[in-house]
Interface confidence: medium
């Protein structure tokens, strides 16, 4: 079968070559070809060219539509929900659950701890942390939430920080911290949230969340 296909391909190629040669001869006004033949061949050739050009136009239109749809500059957004963790780590844990957002694979939640972006650009990054603490049960130090940036080949830096003193309410008083700002992120950059005491963080619906949006 393969051999027959090859022969067929070669025959087609030969026919194409003869066709092109004939056009060439028509153009040079060779006498061995009748005018009728030449006209017929020329119109056939023009038809092919027209088809090719029309196809090109269609592709162009499709591509410009794709661009309009935003494929060249896709929306990049994420909103993740807090997740209680048995680990004593100061890094807050997040999950894609409830009413979360993960626009596409240009932003990912890595190990449940950090949002990582694949494209460079300006991003609005935010976090809301709700915590319940009591002055007597807590240390003297305030509750601090930090939004941190980790770039490839570079160690982390603090982007934003907020501190709240502990409540006198018993057993504990609920307070919320909101952090948000616009930052330039490099491809592969990650952002995460650190708190001084993760055991005090409230994980009820809507209390603690984290996200970003590419501007």
């Amino acid at each position: 079968h393969r051999r027959l296909d090859k022969i067929e391909d070669e025959r087609n190629l030969h026919e194409d070559f003869v066709f092109m040669k004939t056009i060439q001869r028509c153009n040079t006004g060779e006498r061995s070809l009748s005018l009728l033949n030449c006209e017929e061949i020329k119109s056939q050739f023009e038809g092919f060219v027209k088809d090719i050009m029309l196809n090109k136009e269609e592709t162009k239109k499709e591509n410009s539509f794709e661009m309009q749809k935003g494929d060249q500059n896709p929306q990049i957004a994420a909103h993740v929900i807090s997740e209680a963790s048995s680990k004593t780590t100061s890094v807050l844990q997040w999950a894609e659950k409830g009413y979360y957002t993960m626009s596409n694979n240009l932003v990912t939640l890595e190990n449940g701890k950090q949002l990582t972006v694949k494209r460079q650009g300006l991003y609005y990054i935010y976090a809301q942390v709700t915590f319940c603490s009591n002055r007597e049960a807590s240390s003297q130090a305030p509750f601090i939430a930090s939004l941190c940036l980790k770039s490839p080949g570079r160690f982390e830096r603090i982007l934003l920080r907020a501190a709240n003193t502990h409540s006198s309410a018993k057993p504990c008083g609920q307070q919320s911290i909101h952090l948000g700002g616009v930052f330039e992120l490099q491809p592969g950059a990650s952002v995460f949230v650190n708190v001084t005491d993760p055991s005090q963080v409230s994980h009820g619906t809507g209390f603690t969340s984290f996200g970003l949006l590419k501007l």
């Epitope: 490839p152 080949g153 982390e156 995460f192």
Partner: nanobody
Framework: EVQLLESGGGLVQPGGSLRLSCAAS????????MMWVRQAPGKGLEWVSA????????YYADSVKGRFTISRDNSKNTLYLQMNSLRAEDTAVYYC????????????????WGQGTLVTVSS
Amino acid sequence: EVQLLESGGGLVQPGGSLRLSCAASGFTFELYRMMWVRQAPGKGLEWVSAISSDGDTTYYADSVKGRFTISRDNSKNTLYLQMNSLRAEDTAVYYCAEHWLGTTLSLRDFDYWGQGTLVTVSS
């Protein structure tokens, strides 16, 4: 302040074993992919092994595959490299660093390096 402190190097006979440690501080160790690189006398940096932030995924250079084992203890902020069946060509200063998928491997690419630990394999 970020610090990476390598230890465990020394003189060992061919076929012997060593365990290197890298104590990390000043950054959130559990979020970082880490790696070991080495620099043999008069040579450039060579990537040896890497490990994912949670320790579940490991990578090795062909030259050390089956002989070296990378591991980490996030609760202790420490990275390890168990080196078995050591050869003369493993002689080098070993450094730990954050692993990222850069195309080059030069000290300039990273903010922090430890002082390294010298491993000498000789009879």
